[in-house]
C-alpha cells in the first residue's frame, strides 16, 4: 500500500460564465475552492482502481474534476468517457504534484456518466473513476412554514415540509413597521424550530433550502395599536392550521382577553393564554386562537376582546383553492426619455405569490410589498427607459397570473436608410410613430423641396426584440427619379430627422443625415 502513489481527487465548482462543452485541460479556469472527493482504493478490483465520491451537480453547472498525484517522476494519462478517449495534459503544481484536470462546462445530461482517468507513472499504472450525475431538483420542494403548539408547553413549533430538509429560523422584531426590515438591527434571528418567547411585536418563521426561502408571519392583533382603516383579512386553505395572536398591554394584571368567532366564544382547546411582566412592570397578555385544520365553517369575524381595551376583529376567509386577484388587462405607458417611472401591479393573493418581471426574454427579480388594505403591490422601475413589452408573471400553488405592459419612450425619430436596385427604404423608431415625406433633389430643387408622392408605401412593424414599433417607408424606383438624390424625412411632435440616398446605387449610400428639430 505504501508503494502506491498518494492520490487526491477534487471537484472545483465554477461560477458559470462560459458555454462550451467538456474538455480536458491542464489549466482550469479561475474558480471556487477545491472540494475533496475522498478518493479511495476500490476493494476487490482487478488492477489499482481509485474511486472518487459521487459528484452530483446542477444542470448547467461548470465543474472541474481534478486529480493530484504525489508520485516521483513523469506521468502520462488518458481520459475515457463513454468509450471516447479525451486527450490529457498533466502539469505539475508548486508542491511538484502531478495535476490532471477535466473541465465540464455547462453540465448537460449527455455529459453525465463515468469519467475514467488512466495514469501511467514510472512506478505503476492505475485508474481513477469519477461518477458525475445531474442533481434531481425536480424532487425538491420548499413549502411555506406553518405553526403547531408544542405538546404540554406554551411554545410554538415551526414546520416546513420541504426537500431537502430546510433550515428553520424564527425572525423576531420588537419595533414597528419599517425598522422590522430583514437586515435591520432590531431584527433577531433564532435558528431553531421551537419558540418560547411569544410576546414580541413581529414574529415570523422562515424555512430555507437549496430552492430559496419562504416565510410565514404570525398573524397578530395588537389591542394597544389603533386599528387599521380596513379590517385585517387572513386567508387560509381548507386543512391548513389557523393561528391568530391577540396581544394587549396594561398597567396591571387586572384585565382579561377573550376570543369570539361571530359573537360565539371559542371552544376550549382552541385557545391558550400567556402573560408576562414587561421591564416597566406593565402586564403583557397574549391569547392565541388556533384551529389545527380549518374547514369552511371556520370562516368569519374573529374578535379579540379585553376588559380594558377596545376590541378588534379580523376576517378569516377559508378557501378551497388558492387565488390571485388582479386586473389582467394590458396597460400602455408613454414617458419622456428622463422621466422617472415604475410599472406596478396591485393584487390580492393566497398563498403568497412567486413573481418575475420579464423584458426581452430576460427575467428580473420581483419584490412585493403588503399594503394595509390586504392588497400587495409589486413595482418594477429598472426599465432603463427601454421601450417595449414588459411582462409581470405571478404564480402560487393553485393559480397563475400574467399582465402585459407596453412602454413607449417619447423621442424624435432617428432615420436609417437602405437602397436596392428597385427601391429605397427608410426606417425610424421614434415615438409617437413618425409620419414620412420623400423629396427629390435636383437642379430645380437644390434644397430638396420637390415632394414625391408617387410610389411611396408606409408601414409600421413590430421589432420583435423589444416588442417596440418601428415605422418604415419605401419608395419604389421610377424612371423619373433614377439617378437622383432623394431625401426621406420622418417627423413627429418632438422633431424631424432626414436621410439622403442616391438612387441607382447598389447599396445604401447615406449621403447626408439631417437632424431638424
Amino acid at each position: 500500500n505504501q508503494d502506491l502513489p498518494v492520490i487526491k481527487c477534487v471537484l472545483i465548482n465554477h461560477k458559470n460564465n462560459d458555454s462550451s462543452v467538456g474538455k480536458s485541460s491542464s489549466y482550469p479556469m479561475v474558480s471556487e475552492s477545491p472540494e475533496d472527493l475522498g478518493c479511495a482504493l476500490r476493494p476487490q478490483s482487478s488492477g489499482t482502481v481509485y474511486e472518487a465520491a459521487a459528484v452530483e451537480v446542477d444542470v448547467s453547472a461548470s465543474i472541474t474534476l481534478q486529480v493530484l498525484v504525489d508520485a516521483p517522476g513523469n506521468i502520462s494519462c488518458l481520459w475515457v468517457f463513454k468509450h471516447s478517449s479525451l486527450n490529457c495534459q498533466p502539469h505539475f503544481d508548486l508542491q511538484n504534484r502531478g495535476v490532471v484536470s477535466m473541465v465540464i462546462l455547462k453540465m448537460t445530461e449527455t455529459q453525465a456518466g463515468e469519467y475514467l482517468l488512466f495514469i501511467q507513472s514510472e512506478a505503476t499504472n492505475y485508474t481513477i473513476l469519477f461518477t458525475v450525475s445531474i442533481r434531481n431538483t425536480l424532487l425538491y420542494t420548499l413549502r411555506r412554514p406553518y405553526f403547531r403548539k408544542m405538546e404540554n408547553q406554551d411554545a410554538l413549533v415551526c414546520i416546513s415540509e420541504s426537500v431537502p430538509e430546510p433550515i428553520v429560523e424564527w425572525v423576531l422584531c420588537d419595533s414597528q413597521g419599517e425598522s422590522c426590515k430583514e437586515e435591520s438591527p432590531a431584527v433577531v434571528k433564532k435558528e431553531e424550530k421551537v419558540l418560547h418567547e411569544l410576546f414580541g411585536t413581529d414574529i415570523r418563521c422562515c424555512a430555507r433550502n437549496e430552492l430559496g426561502r419562504e416565510c410565514t408571519r404570525l398573524f397578530t392583533i395588537d389591542l394597544n395599536q389603533t386599528p387599521q382603516t380596513t379590517l385585517p383579512q387572513l386567508f387560509l386553505k381548507v386543512g391548513e392550521p389557523l393561528w391568530i395572536r391577540c396581544k394587549a398591554v396594561h398597567v396591571n394584571h387586572g384585565f382579561g382577553l377573550t376570543w369570539e368567532l361571530e359573537n360565539k366564544a371559542l371552544e376550549e382547546g382552541n385557545y391558550f393564554e400567556m402573560s408576562t411582566y414587561s421591564t416597566n412592570r406593565t402586564m403583557i397578555r397574549i391569547l392565541f386562537a388556533f384551529v389545527s385544520s380549518v374547514a369552511r365553517n371556520d370562516t368569519g369575524y374573529y374578535t379579540c376582546s379585553s376588559s380594558k381595551h377596545p376590541s378588534q376583529s379580523a376576517l378569516v376567509t377559508i378557501v378551497e383553492k388558492g387565488f390571485i386577484n388582479a386586473t389582467n388587462s394590458s396597460e400602455d405607458y408613454e414617458i419622456d426619455q428622463y422621466e422617472e417611472f415604475c410599472f406596478s401591479v396591485r393584487f390580492k393573493a393566497y398563498p403568497q405569490i412567486r413573481c418575475t418581471w420579464t423584458f426581452s426574454r430576460k427575467s428580473f427579480p420581483c419584490e412585493q410589498k403588503g399594503l394595509d388594505n390586504g392588497y400587495s403591490i409589486s413595482k418594477f422601475c429598472n426599465h432603463k427607459h427601454q421601450p417595449g413589452e414588459y411582462i409581470f408573471h405571478a404564480e402560487n400553488d393553485d393559480a397563475q397570473f400574467t399582465k402585459m405592459f407596453t412602454l413607449n419612450i417619447r423621442r424624435k425619430p432617428q432615420v436609417l436608410a437602405e437602397a436596392s436596385a428597385s427601391q429605397a427604404s427608410c426606417f425610424s423608431d421614434g415615438y409617437p410613430l413618425p409620419s414620412w415625406t420623400w423629396k427629390k433633389c435636383s437642379d430645380k430643387s437644390p434644397n430638396c423641396t420637390e415632394e414625391i408622392t408617387e410610389g411611396v408605401w408606409n408601414r409600421k412593424a413590430n421589432r420583435k426584440v423589444f416588442g417596440q414599433w418601428v415605422s418604415s417607408s419605401t419608395l419604389n424606383m421610377s424612371e423619373a427619379i433614377k439617378g437622383f438624390l432623394v431625401k426621406c424625412c420622418a417627423y413627429n411632435s418632438l422633431g424631424t430627422s432626414c436621410e439622403t440616398i442616391l438612387l441607382n446605387s447598389p447599396g445604401p449610400f447615406p449621403f447626408i443625415q439631417d437632424n431638424i428639430s
Epitope: G38, A40, E56, E114, P164, E210
Partner: antibody, heavy 127, light 107 residues
C-alpha cells in the same frame, strides 16, 4: 485539507437539550455524495455511532436514541447540527463528527465508513 | 440492529509480536467492515475499510480479512506506536454499529 470541527457547550444540565455543531471545510455537503456522522464515546467506554446525514438530506439514527436525536445541515455555512433532547448524566461523553464519502451513482451508493474525523468535543451532563 | 462482538477485549503483547483481533457480526454484512485505531485523548483513525483494503498512508503491517460474519485485523509485527484501542465498525446496514473495542497493551 479536509477538516471537521465540533463545537457546543461543555456543560449541560439534566433534562436540557444539547446542540452540537460540526463545521466542515475542504469538502462540500452539496456537490458530492458526502455524509457526516456523529459518534460519541463515554469516558473509558467504546465508540457509539449516533446519526448521519447525507448531501441529499437522507439521514439515519441510532435506534435506542432515535426519539431524542435530530440531525440537520446548513450547506451555506458548511455545518451539520445534532440536537439531543432530555440530556442525562449517562450522556456525558466526547462527541465526534466524521465524514462519510459515498461512492457509486444512479441511486446505487456504497460507503466505506468514516474516513476523516474531527478532534471531538467533551460534554458533561451535571446539575 | 446488527451487533458487533469484538474479542479479546484486551491483550498484552511485545514489540514484534503478531497480533490478531476478531470481530463477529450478528448477521451477514458481506465485506462492509472497517477497522479503526484510537489512542488516548485522540480521535479514531481509519486503518482498513471493506474488510481488507488498507487506508492510504497506513503501514502494510496492518491487514484485514473476512467476509459475512467473521472478520480479523492482523498486525504482523507490533511497533511501539501500535499500542492503542482498536474498534471494528459495520457499515453494511443503518444504523451502523461499532464493536466494543480491543485494547492492545505492552507486555
Amino acid at each position: 485539507q479536509v477538516t471537521l470541527k465540533e463545537s457546543g457547550p461543555v456543560l449541560v444540565k439534566p433534562t436540557e437539550t444539547l446542540t452540537l455543531t460540526c463545521t466542515v471545510s475542504g469538502f462540500s455537503l452539496i456537490n458530492a455524495r458526502m455524509g457526516v456522522s456523529w459518534i460519541r464515546q463515554p469516558p473509558g467506554k467504546a465508540l457509539e455511532w449516533l446519526a448521519h446525514i447525507f448531501s441529499n438530506a437522507e439521514k439515519s439514527y441510532r435506534t435506542s436514541l432515535k426519539s431524542r436525536l435530530t440531525i440537520s445541515k446548513d450547506t451555506s455555512k458548511s455545518q451539520v447540527v445534532l440536537t439531543m433532547t432530555n440530556m442525562d448524566p449517562v450522556d456525558t461523553a466526547t462527541y465526534y463528527c466524521a465524514r462519510i464519502p459515498g461512492y457509486g451513482g444512479n441511486g446505487d451508493y456504497h460507503y466505506y465508513g468514516m474516513d476523516v474525523w474531527g478532534q471531538g468535543t467533551t460534554v458533561t451532563v451535571s446539575s | 440492529d446488527i451487533q458487533m462482538t469484538q474479542s479479546p477485549s484486551s491483550l498484552s503483547a511485545s514489540l514484534g509480536d503478531r497480533v490478531t483481533i476478531t470481530c463477529r457480526a450478528s448477521q451477514g454484512i458481506r465485506n462492509d467492515l472497517g477497522w479503526y485505531q484510537q489512542k488516548p485523548g485522540k480521535a479514531p483513525k481509519r486503518l482498513i475499510y471493506a474488510s481488507s483494503t488498507l487506508q492510504s498512508g497506513v503501514p502494510s503491517r496492518f491487514s484485514g480479512s473476512g467476509s459475512g460474519t467473521e472478520f480479523t485485523l492482523t498486525i504482523s509485527s507490533l511497533q511501539p506506536e501500535d499500542f492503542a484501542t482498536y474498534y471494528c465498525l459495520q457499515h453494511n446496514n443503518f444504523p451502523w454499529t461499532f464493536g466494543q473495542g480491543t485494547k492492545v497493551e505492552i507486555k
